[in-house]
């Protein structure tokens, strides 16, 4: 659920949650499944060449409320969605890149400081 450009984090569970992980598997994961006291997530972001990259995995409870809030970051195209309703719920998350802003069209995907 998004309001004013932010998505709110779902309610954490009183038991361990298993999530699919891809490009973001911790050492204690098994067969691309991680476990957490917090949330499963799927995130899409642009890499340095402007290509969309999807990562998924586990977010620990501590600090994940903030991470799941998907606050827009200037000059960074990124979107994250979180879930807790069932194990591997992030298999069904499909965040999309936010639209390019006018300024981004001018600058292109690579920003020089």
């Amino acid at each position: 659920k998004k309001e004013d450009g932010e998505s709110t984090a779902p309610t954490p569970r009183p038991k361990i949650l298993r999530c699919k992980c891809h490009h973001h598997c911790p050492e204690d994961s098994v067969n691309n499944i991680c476990s957490t006291d917090g949330y499963c997530f799927t995130m899409i972001e642009e890499d340095d060449s402007g290509m969309p990259v999807v990562t998924s995995g586990c977010l620990g409870l501590e600090g994940s409320d903030f991470q799941c809030r998907d606050t827009p970051i200037p000059h960074q195209r990124r979107s994250i969605e979180c879930c807790t309703e069932r194990n591997e719920c992030n298999k069904d998350l499909h965040p999309t890149l936010p639209p390019l802003k006018n300024r981004d069209f001018v600058d292109g995907p690579i920003h020089h400081k």
Epitope: K15, I16, S29, C34, S35, T36, G38, C58, R86, E88
Partner: antibody, heavy 116, light 112 residues
Amino acid sequence: QVQLQQPGAEVVRPGASLKLSCKASGYTFTSYWMQWIKQRPGQGLEWIGEIDPSDNYTMYNQKFKGKATLTVDTSSSTAYMQLSSLTSEDSAVYFCARFGFYVDYWGQGTTLTVSS
Amino acid sequence: DVVMTQTPLSLPVSLGDQASISCRSSQSLVHSTGNTYLHWYLQKPGQSPNLLIYKVSNRFSGVPDRFSGSGSGTDFTLKISRVEAEDLGVYFCSQSTHVPFTFGSGTKLEIK
């Protein structure tokens, strides 16, 4: 109070299959995982696997894949473990146990004897 | 699989003594969330195990304060400050950081 009720003992023939039960009470069944643990004298405790009754999601110890199958019936708050192709190596005490982030309550265990 | 090594295997004590049991894991038990899922159980003869300590140092409800847990990483200790007759039995450490979850082989606390 939390209770996990298991039958005291079962005796079966080699090669047979058996379904062990574990009836939970005193808490919301779907709010915790249910684990199954094997104990043989002199062999310590072995984790077989676990099931989340809220979505039937299972995790198994590779060693017990093909030997054990975990299921639940949420309407009766009962967890089951089916053991197949039983041999004398399967003779043991089998515990069910409630798991959130750690096991906090155990059933009394079912003593399984595989004998001809 | 993570191997949990408990020492000693047998611990003869006099009532009122302090007892100390060690548990070492073959890998760090610090989970990616930052939690350390190391727990201690007591199993009395003919009974199922009972939870004493969870996540290294947290006493489970109803567990007397003479039981304490400590440690980090791969090295953990359970201490009983003044052993009572009801404390006799087999103590197990257990980890739920890595799948498959594993247990120590047990330490038998008995009267000297």
